[in-house]
C-alpha cells in the first residue's frame, strides 16, 4: 500500500496472507471456515495461508496449507479479465475474535462510496519496502466511465476502480487478492494498476466482487 | 548508464544443460523485467522467456516449457537462464533484456519494452 | 499464443527512399507493439515502443502506426545507418512473439 497507515490492529480479522514459502505472495480474503477469496494471478501449486494476525511472519498466527485453488472458468492471462479465485484450505480455520469471515455484498456500491483496501505489499515504488505491519488506505469507487478515461480498453466490465483524485495512495505489488472493503462488505480484490505504484489519478483496478457472488457460492458447494 | 554483461560462450555436448548469466552493472533490475531472447545463425529472434523479479513473476514460451529455467538473485542484480536436454537446434546467441513494468498485478506482463540488451552468449550445442 | 507475420522478409531500396514495414498481429493487441533494429553480431536496438512512441536517441525519420492487429513501421529518408534488419514484437501479454524480420538492404 502505497501512502497509506498502519491499520487499527484486528480491523481486518478476514484479512490473510497467501505465503510461498516464508514470503509474501498476495493478499486474500476469507469468505467461509474453509475457504479464502483471492485473484486468480495469484494462482500457485500450493499456499502457506497465514490468518488471525496484522503482522506478517507472526508465530502465534494461524498457519494452514492449501493445496487446492479453483480461478473462475472466465479468467484470461491476456486480458486478465474474472481475476477471481477461491482457495480451499486443506484444514477449517478455527474462527475468533481475530478471524472472522468477511461479508459478501449483497449488492454494488455506487461510485463515491468510501472504502479501505488493505495488504502487507509494498509500501514504495518502485523501489520495495515490504512492511511487516498490515497497512491500510481509504479510497473511494470510481465510474467506469471516469476510469476508461485512463485504461481504455484494459478497463473490462467486472473491474472495478478506486482512489483519491491527485492523491498517491494506492495498492502495489504484493497487495494482489487483498480486500477492498465498503460499508462493511467485500467489493473487491486487489488486480492491478500502473507501475511504478502511487501515481497520482491512476486509481486501483479490482475484480468487482458483487458480480461473482452466485460464481463464489456455486463453487464453494461443489468443491465441499 | 546501466548495462547488461552475459558471460561467456558455451560449448555443449546434446542432452546436457547450460546456465547463462546476465548481470546488471551501474545499476539494479528488481524493478525491471528481465527477458531472454534467443537467435540461431541466420535466423530471426525468438522469446523464450521473461521474469520480474519484485512481482516474481515467470513466463516462457511454450515452446520451453519444461526445458528453462529463468531466475534472478536480487541481491548481485544477475538474471539467469537454464536450458536443459540441449539438441544441436539450441545453437544460438543468447540475449538478455531489461525493460521496465508498465503495471503491476495482474496486467505486469502488459507493454514491457526492452530498451537495454547484453551483448549475448553463443552457445554451440555439438557431439 | 499471438503469431506476428510481417512483411515484406527483404526489401531493396536506396538512400533517401522511403521505406514501410509491416507488421500483423492474428488477434487483437491494443497499441502494444515494439519494433526493433538489428545490425549483423550486434544485440537487437529499441526504436518504437506502443506502437507509435519513439525511443529516446532514435532518429525522427523513424515512425510508427498502427493499433489492433495492423502495424507499420516507416523510415522517411533511408540513411546509410539504416540497413538493417527490422522486427516487430506483440507486446499485448506473455508469451512476446517477434515477426519473422524484414532485411533491408541497398539496391
Known amino acids: 500500500i502505497i501512502d497509506g497507515y498502519k491499520c487499527k490492529e484486528g480491523s481486518h480479522p478476514w484479512q490473510v496472507a497467501l505465503l510461498k514459502g516464508n514470503q509474501l505472495h498476495c493478499g486474500g480474503v476469507l469468505v467461509d471456515k474453509y475457504w479464502v477469496l483471492t485473484a486468480a494471478h495469484c494462482k500457485m501449486g500450493q499456499y502457506q495461508v497465514q490468518l488471525g494476525s496484522d503482522k506478517i511472519g507472526d508465530q502465534s498466527a494461524q498457519k494452514i496449507k492449501a493445496t487446492k485453488s479453483f480461478r473462475h472458468p472466465g479468467y484470461s492471462t491476456k486480458t486478465h479479465v474474472n481475476d477471481i479465485m477461491l482457495v480451499r484450505l486443506d484444514e477449517p480455520v478455527k474462527m475468533s475474535s481475530k478471524v472472522e469471515a468477511v461479508q459478501l455484498p449483497e449488492h454494488c456500491e455506487p461510485p463515491g462510496t468510501s472504502c479501505t483496501v488493505s495488504g502487507w505489499g509494498t509500501t514504495t515504488s518502485p523501489d520495495v519496502t515490504f512492511p511487516s505491519d498490515l497497512m491500510c488506505s481509504d479510497v473511494k469507487l470510481i465510474s467506469s466511465r471516469e476510469c476508461k478515461k485512463v485504461y481504455k480498453d484494459l478497463l473490462g466490465k467486472t473491474m472495478l476502480c478506486a482512489g483519491i483524485p491527485d492523491s498517491k495512495t494506492n495498492t502495489c505489488n504484493g497487495d494482489s487478492g487483498g480486500p477492498l472493503v465498503c460499508n462493511d462488505t467485500l467489493q473487491g480484490l486487489v488486480s492491478w494498476g500502473t507501475y511504478p505504484c502511487g501515481q497520482p489519478n491512476d486509481p486501483g483496478v479490482y475484480t468487482q466482487v458483487c458480480k461473482y457472488k452466485r460464481w463464489v457460492m456455486e463453487t464453494m458447494k461443489t468443491h465441499r | 548508464q546501466v548495462q547488461l554483461v552475459q558471460s561467456g560462450a558455451e560449448v555443449k555436448k546434446p542432452g546436457s544443460s547450460v546456465k547463462v548469466s546476465c548481470k546488471a552493472s551501474?545499476?539494479?533490475?528488481?524493478?525491471?523485467?528481465i527477458s531472454w531472447v534467443r537467435q540461431a545463425p541466420g535466423q530471426g529472434l525468438e522469446w523464450m522467456g521473461a521474469?520480474?523479479?519484485?512481482?516474481?513473476?515467470?513466463n516462457y514460451a511454450q515452446k520451453f516449457q519444461g526445458r528453462v529455467t529463468i531466475t534472478a538473485d536480487e541481491s548481485t542484480s544477475t538474471a539467469y537462464m537454464e536450458l536443459s536436454s540441449l539438441r544441436s537446434e539450441d545453437t544460438a546467441v543468447y540475449y538478455c533484456?531489461?525493460?521496465?513494468?508498465?503495471?503491476?498485478?495482474?496486467?505486469?506482463?502488459?507493454?514491457?519494452?526492452?530498451?537495454?540488451w547484453g551483448q549475448g552468449t553463443m552457445v554451440t550445442v555439438s557431439s | 499464443d499471438i503469431q506476428m507475420t510481417q512483411s515484406p522478409s527483404s526489401v531493396s531500396a536506396s538512400v533517401g527512399d522511403r521505406v514501410t514495414i509491416t507488421c500483423r498481429a492474428s488477434?487483437?493487441?491494443?497499441?502494444?507493439l515494439a519494433w526493433y533494429q538489428q545490425k549483423p553480431g550486434k544485440a537487437p536496438k529499441l526504436l518504437i515502443y506502443?506502437?507509435?512512441s519513439l525511443q529516446s536517441g532514435v532518429p525522427s525519420r523513424f515512425s510508427g502506426s498502427g493499433s489492433g492487429t495492423d502495424f507499420t513501421l516507416t523510415i522517411s529518408s533511408l540513411q546509410p545507418e539504416d540497413f538493417a534488419t527490422y522486427y516487430c514484437v506483440q507486446a499485448n501479454a506473455f508469451p512476446y512473439k517477434f515477426g519473422g524480420g524484414t532485411k533491408v538492404e541497398i539496391k
Open positions: 533484456a531489461r525493460g521496465a513494468p508498465n503495471y503491476y498485478g495482474a496486467q505486469s506482463s502488459r507493454g514491457i519494452a526492452f530498451d537495454i
Open positions: 521474469i520480474i523479479p519484485i512481482f516474481g513473476v515467470a
Open positions: 506502443a506502437a507509435s
Open positions: 551501474g545499476g539494479t533490475f528488481n524493478n525491471y523485467a
Open positions: 488477434q487483437g493487441i491494443s497499441s502494444w
